[in-house]
């Protein structure tokens, strides 16, 4: 989580701050959504359980050329302990279900808000 504050960060970002920043970014995406997010691209749905940060990144990293979610992809990589590359899938994906990126972001946002409320930051 150290890198989540960016290059100017004076030290490690507290986990609660990192999660709040990720929530803020997802809120920005949902608020600023004019046209269909990422041209209506579809991604694998995920189980919102332990390990879901990596699973979310694995899903979203397969969306290319969508500047709206680039910051989210970077932030999620800070929560995921291993390197994620396109085409990589974990058991947390609901492999028979694809949803629009906009719905994926909405579902992820709600879950992260609940984690924040419950004090589960990692």
């Amino acid at each position: 989580l150290t890198c989540l504050g960016g290059f100017a960060s004076p030290g490690p970002v507290p986990p609660s701050t990192a999660l709040r920043e990720l929530i803020e970014e997802l809120v920005n995406i949902t608020q600023n959504q004019k046209a269909p997010l990422c041209n209506g691209s579809m991604v694998w749905s995920i189980n919102l359980t332990a390990g879901m940060y990596c699973a979310a990144l694995e899903s979203l990293i397969n969306v290319s050329g969508c500047s709206a979610i680039e910051k989210t992809q970077r932030m999620l990589s800070g929560f995921c302990p291993h390197k994620v590359s396109a085409g990589q899938f974990s058991s947390l994906h609901v492999r028979d279900t694809k949803i629009e990126v906009a719905q994926f972001v909405k579902d992820l946002l709600l879950h992260l808000k609940k984690l924040f409320r419950e004090g589960q930051f990692n």
Epitope: T30, L110, R117
Partner: antibody
């Protein structure tokens, strides 16, 4: 519009169980926490527990642990509270309430903003 | 468990009065995420409670501006700046920061 409609009044014998339902409309229960609060006659409010209907995770007050079970059925938008081993002091009005989130605020936990009408449970031999 | 103690337990006041109800928690109720989930509810006889204030001082939508909340740490207050006839009710504080979440015992506001 948002509504929480609870099941009707119940009269139960000591030692039996009661299951109270709370049917939600006007919102998705997976976007909420659903709470149960009770109020004995002439007494104050007592929080019993809550459920996250999206995953079934529950929190209970220790004094009710083992006697209370809170569940939710997303398909019917209904939350349930079951209380077992009833005793006379469980006579109370039982309320369900929700706490909701929206997509447009970073920190939008709105506490218990909508409540059911209450269900009177009377425990008497 | 965290105890929430309200004072006074009952209070007589007149329409137009400024009224303050206090709520003290037995320990600090700042949540690990930095928020303080201190809420105030109003209840009238035979009715379900209604949310007035959340997170110490945020007024819920539709709640008149005469209701305000303040405080920090362990000491909190609900103020009604100018009592209206419909404000006579019982008021409860509630902490949702540490499980088990707990209500205060209530403050009954009566007409003098």
């Amino acid at each position: 519009q948002v509504q929480l409609v609870q099941s009707g009044a119940e009269v139960k014998k000591p030692g039996s169980s009661v299951k109270v339902s709370c049917k939600a409309s006007g919102f998705y229960i997976k976007d909420t926490y659903m709470h149960w609060v009770r109020q004995a006659p002439g007494q104050g409010l007592e929080w019993m527990g809550t459920i996250d209907p999206a995953n079934g995770n529950t929190k209970y007050v220790p004094k009710f642990q083992g006697r209370v079970t809170i569940t939710a059925d997303e398909s019917t938008s209904t939350a349930y509270m079951e209380l077992s081993s009833l005793r006379s002091e469980d006579t109370a009005v039982y309320y369900c309430a929700r706490s909701i989130y929206d997509d447009y605020h970073v920190d939008d936990y709105y506490a218990m903003d909508y409540w059911g009408q209450g269900t009177l449970v009377t425990v008497s031999s | 468990d965290i105890q929430m103690t309200q004072s006074p337990s009952s209070l007589s006041a007149s329409v137009g009065d400024r009224v303050t109800i206090t709520c003290r928690s037995s320990q600090n109720i700042v949540h690990i995420n930095g928020n303080t989930y201190l809420e105030w509810y109003q209840q009238k006889p035979g009715k379900a409670p209604k949310l007035l204030i959340y997170k110490i001082s945020d007024r819920f939508s539709g709640v008149p501006s005469r209701f305000s909340g303040s405080g920090s740490g362990t000491d909190f207050t609900l103020t009604i700046s100018s009592l209206q006839p419909e404000d006579f009710a019982t008021y409860y504080c509630f902490q949702g920061s540490h499980v088990p979440w707990t209500f205060g015992q209530g403050t009954k506001l009566e007409i003098k």
